[in-house]
Amino acid sequence: IWELKKDVYVVELDWYPDAPGEMVVLTCDTPEEDGITWTLDQSSEVLGSGKTLTIQVKEFGDAGQYTCHKGGEVLSHSLLLLHKKEDGIWSTDILKDQKEPKNKTFLRCEAKNYSGRFTCWWLTTISTDLTFSVKSSRGSSDPQGVTCGAATLSAERVRGDNKEYEYSVECQEDSACPAAEESLPIEVMVDAVHKLKYENYTSSFFIRDIIKPDPPKNLQLKPLKNSRQVEVSWEYPDTWSTPHSYFSLTFCVQVQGKSKREKKDRVFTDKTSATVICRKNASISVRAQDRYYSSSWSEWASVPCS
Amino acid sequence: RAVPGGSSPAWTQCQQLSQKLCTLAWSAHPLVGHMDLREEGDEETTNDVPHIQCGDGCDPQGLRDNSQFCLQRIHQGLIFYEKLLGSDIFTGEPSLLPDSPVGQLHASLLGLSQLLQPEGHHWETQQIPSLSPSQPWQRLLLRFKILRSLQAFVAVAARVFAHGAATLSP
């Protein structure tokens, strides 16, 4: 058993049939010594008396809010949550496996630049009685600070018969050093509580591996005289790290016909302009990637050829 | 060329070669199958690699003030990785794929380190970890880790030389 926060405790249970469970001793936070009784949740049934209560926690029915009283007055509460371990593996019932970039990916994170700011998100099908708390650090043995905000519901989607809820959180490394080569990964820890079930999820990454620039901005076409060619130009996204002579991007320019089956023409360039042939009804798209480290490409920025 | 006395390197040449190094490092190990390195053991070889840290002066401001600290750090790393790529980890069993660019990568690391430090000038180089052969089955994992680490190192080096070529070239 361990304390998650004040008056909230997590009991770690091996979850198999006929498991003996965990013996837990609760102590009433009071100077009083006698006349103390204990109840669980809204029930008025007295579970025991005395300053301490010993219980055998085996299942969710044994978890909940234990309250000690004296003469009708509430003295203190202890909320017991359960963390299930089945076949040696902690349960992951609350969050959905996003399966990208590999199985058992529950948290996904992205950064728009090297400033030390990043966003993580996760998915669940649970809509009520759900709370999250997020902690993060750089490194684990001698952790350096990363400050995370509160997790918020950022999207709702219908997937078949189910509703899916996306939560996200923004974090910022306290003393980020954008130009340095990271040697210790960022660790993100999410505590999830659904009713009386506790689970924790972690992700470990380098900012460089989760970089995904915003799409290029101000995408423009300039027709070239007496030619089907056009000059496409664009700019670095505002959110990208500066100076651009140091934090450089590379770009992919694509000419795509109306039909998805039509052959795509692609050009790769380090410049912020390119000359391409504009076909009728086609569109021109440009995306960006870090020039020197193969992290994710940005989403496409597009303009029609006409 | 960067020399301990403080003259400038051939920024443009260094920029071209460091960008080539980035391409080679990624073609030597594209991120396929996404192995989570932090779940694996055998850390000792990759823990000792020289990283370009915050105080090494490789940021734009630090390069403007005095690029020598940063160039020395980059040189140190290039020599370190050049030794690792020539070590048993890469030259031993199991064989690399026939068209593996590791040989080219090895030669380019040496080429860039020589651009930074001509013969006769000696910066202190970091101690190379023991190159005694690990068991062959450990090597694929070590190769993977070293190449991933090298990708990060050469990315910073390439940014330094690109910025130097754009803003510090005579």
């Epitope: - | 070590s87 069993e93 199991p94 090895h106 190159l131 052969p133 089955w137």
Partner: antibody, heavy 114, light 112 residues
């Protein structure tokens, strides 16, 4: 084209030493370790040791307890295997094989006889 | 040292028929990188060994697809789907998981 060309057959007396050479061509000599393997008449193949041509680091089969020494001359792209304190059971064909074992020398017959 | 036990010692086969050779390792050759560190060779009379299969199941360059390798970490098999006259010789398996590398005792394939 990758080629490993070994030195010619040798006849040695018991207690003597033999040094077999293996000249490599068609690839960058320092990019690949070189193994040495032997095969006594009618016997299975037996791995003797390996050398990293970059640094000269070696790993030997303990069966040969200090009797085997593998060296390289990188300027000549040549690997050498020396076996000392020869006995009659060392009569065998000795092969060099590049890392990966896809390329082998043609073999060198060493006969130990009084 | 890892001991490799190879069977059978001799294998008479009719051309066009399949053939199978087994090697058993005293220690698993499958490691956490998912690779199984076993090679198969053919040594024709008077020649140097020729690599057929590496990493248990990958055919070496120029090796016909009638040769295939499979197995678990300890029990490994070389199969020839249809034996041809040119396949005669001694077949060896070799582990390259740990030093010293060790070979099987060999299987002599002959045409009936």
């Amino acid at each position: 084209e990758v080629q490993l060309v070994q030195s010619g057959a040798e006849v040695k007396k018991p207690g003597a030493s033999v040094k077999v050479s293996c000249k490599a061509s068609g690839y960058s000599f320092t990019d690949h370790n070189m193994n040495w393997v032997r095969q006594a008449p009618g016997q299975r193949l037996e791995w003797m040791g390996v050398i990293n041509p970059n640094y000269g680091t070696t790993t030997y089969n303990q069966k040969f307890k200090g009797r085997v020494t593998i060296t390289v001359d990188t300027s000549a792209s040549t690997a050498y295997m020396e076996l000392s304190s020869l006995r009659s059971e060392d009569t065998a064909v000795y092969y060099c094989a590049r890392r990966g074992f896809a390329y082998w020398g043609q073999g060198t017959l060493v006969t130990v006889s009084s | 040292d890892i001991v490799i036990t190879q069977t059978p010692l001799s294998l008479p086969v009719t051309p066009g028929e399949p053939a199978s050779i087994s090697c058993r390792s005293s220690k698993s050759l499958l490691y956490k990188d998912g690779k199984t560190y076993l090679n198969w060779f053919l040594q024709r009379p008077g020649q140097s060994p020729q690599l057929l299969i590496y990493l248990m199941s990958t055919r070496a360059s120029g090796v016909p697809d009638r040769f295939s390798g499979s197995g678990s970490g300890t029990d490994l098999t070389l199969k020839i789907s249809r034996v041809e006259a040119e396949d005669v010789g001694v077949y060896y398996c070799q582990q390259i998981a740990e030093y010293p590398f060790t070979f099987g005792s060999g299987t002599k394939l002959e045409i009936k």
